[in-house]
Amino acid sequence: SEITLGKYLFERLKQVNVNTVFGLPGDFNLSLLDKIYEVEGMRWAGNANELNAAYAADGYARIKGMSCIITTFGVGELSALNGIAGSYAEHVGVLHVVGVPSISAQAKQLLLHHTLGNGDFTVFHRMSANISETTAMITDIATAPAEIDRCIRTTYVTQRPVYLGLPANLVDLNVPAKLLQTPIDMSLKPNDAESEKEVIDTILALVKDAKNPVILADACCSRHDVKAETKKLIDLTQFPAFVTPMGKGSIDEQHPRYGGVYVGTLSKPEVKEAVESADLILSVGALLSDFNTGSFSYSYKTKNIVEFHSDHMKIRNATFPGVQMKFVLQKLLTTIADAAKGYKPVAVPARTPANAAVPASTPLKQEWMWNQLGNFLQEGDVVIAETGTSAFGINQTTFPNNTYGISQVLWGSIGFTTGATLGAAFAAEEIDPKKRVILFIGDGSLQLTVQEISTMIRWGLKPYLFVLNNDGYTIEKLIHGPKAQYNEIQGWDHLSLLPTFGAKDYETHRVATTGEWDKLTQDKSFNDNSKIRMIEIMLPVFDAPQNLVEQAKLTAATNAKQ
């Protein structure tokens, strides 16, 4: 039997656990979108705009391993590109499917709408190429299924965006249905045996000699699916384990060997000391960006650094291209306990102590709030922190085990998290309807992407939306222009947003004191994700987590350097 190419695409996506597709309709993709309704278990999210759709696809992929966004040629796809670039930067697998004009229209170089009027139909495809792992423009129905499979595999395996152009006239053509009976091969190609052996032997020798080793889990630990291996590595070796800001949520923070968040000079002193005095650092999935490293302020005393990456390994100054960390870790786990048996476990840095008791009328401040937040969180929560005070503040919160952390530390596109919350909420609902999705976003950031709350309401999704109202772009005020008009924003009536977007079953709260925070977060009904909630957190204008204040100084200095 045969099925249409459009249906083939959606069946393949369903096979790899992608059940929600993001994007907007446009005349070059409408026929494709018809097919989504023919595939049981698939849904079309229907976003408010393409940028938000890209952010949503990113959030969904961080939870489920990959995602798909569909846009239309030119006007639609270009609106998504900032979001797609963020997914590229941060190693997130998003398949970007673009409905393009028919092959005959392209061949005739017709001056169609949504074109630049110059007959060039490849220009937008070329724009996307630099922020995609691979691209495909389908031109031949015979090879189309294999191209779709290649694009899905590449998206998933490399954890990078992939661009797939589908001409409007091809999606209704038929392909053999039996192709769906063979799963797409998602396996990694094995490492070169000789290189892999050299890597493993070298690591084992370093482990054997180490007196003061540490494990540092970073962004690509979760993005490239080695969280389980890393947890086992900690269990087997008992080495102290730390995370970077981008690694937050990639290891269990209730583990007795968890030591805290390492951000170079911005770390707590005892964390800084523990990591920087180590004689061996096993760095899993490092992504050494400025905000992830305290403006490149790592100051290791040792040269014995092993970097585990998805597509290479680095030991001291030697790089081993093509040696993938997944296999290295799996093989290491069979022998590392023996190599580490001489290690005498040292104490890990103490947890941040609980907040001291203060009068209930004490005005809420960030330092107190982020520390207190850990009491509200539950195992399995998805915690999403917007660029700005939230992304820095969340580093002070100790997560329960199995918490998903989402923030965009490297790309840092303001407003990203509203869309990402939508995507994460879809993903969480598909995994477990009781799984909570909790957003922390500033009043300034929210103004860029607020429309996507409407999509959450449309689908009955129930995230917690904590809006930190500190009257403007606080992170930017701290970096430059504390009193500048360009860092000011129009104040909104945040608690009217949910009904404005048509919510019927919702809650709104305004919290300004420590007592109000505790009363709300300890309320049993508030702890169940039974409805969408907007919580406005009233904060002083220049209030910010201390690590952000320090980072802002470093960033300002970097920006001013000649």
């Epitope: 069946e11 369903k14 096979q15 790899v16 656990n17 059940n19 049981e40 278990g41 391993g65 998933y156 799963p183 797409i184 091969d185 998602m186 396996s187 699916d225 389980a228 195992e379 399995g380 199995n402 598909e430 995994i431 477990d432």
Partner: nanobody, 120 residues
């Protein structure tokens, strides 16, 4: 981490039916793709069937397609293999297996296996 325990194997006549069950421990069963493999005496272990997280995409080896059905119940952390029209060549140890992500990757976790013997 997930632990897998198979049950339901046994000795049956050719043409009969049998349902294998696999009980999985672990909070996040519904984020694992689930598989059945089998190994006949003196042969390599071979793929039989697999299903994605939601149980709404299923894959089968050509040798069992149309006779075997894989299903899962995420509320009970169970995966099943309904085997109809059994043949002597279906005799093997059947293994339940799980992968943390998608079908199409080598499973991370394996059960101990359950013996199925089909007599002619």
């Amino acid at each position: 981490q997930v632990q897998l325990v198979e049950s339901g194997g046994g000795l049956v006549q050719a043409g009969a039916s049998l349902t294998l069950s696999c009980a999985a421990s672990g909070r996040t069963f519904n984020t694992y793709s689930m598989h059945w493999f089998r190994q006949a005496p003196g042969k390599e272990r071979e793929f039989v069937a697999a299903t994605n997280w939601g149980g709404n995409s299923k894959f089968y080896a050509d040798s069992v397609r149309g006779r075997f059905t894989i299903s899962r119940d995420n509320t009970k952390n169970m995966v099943y293999l309904q085997m109809n029209s059994l043949k002597p060549e279906d005799t093997a140890v059947y293994y339940c297996a799980a992968h943390r992500t998608v079908v199409g990757k080598t499973p991370d976790y394996w059960g101990q296996g359950t013996q199925v013997t089909v007599s002619s």
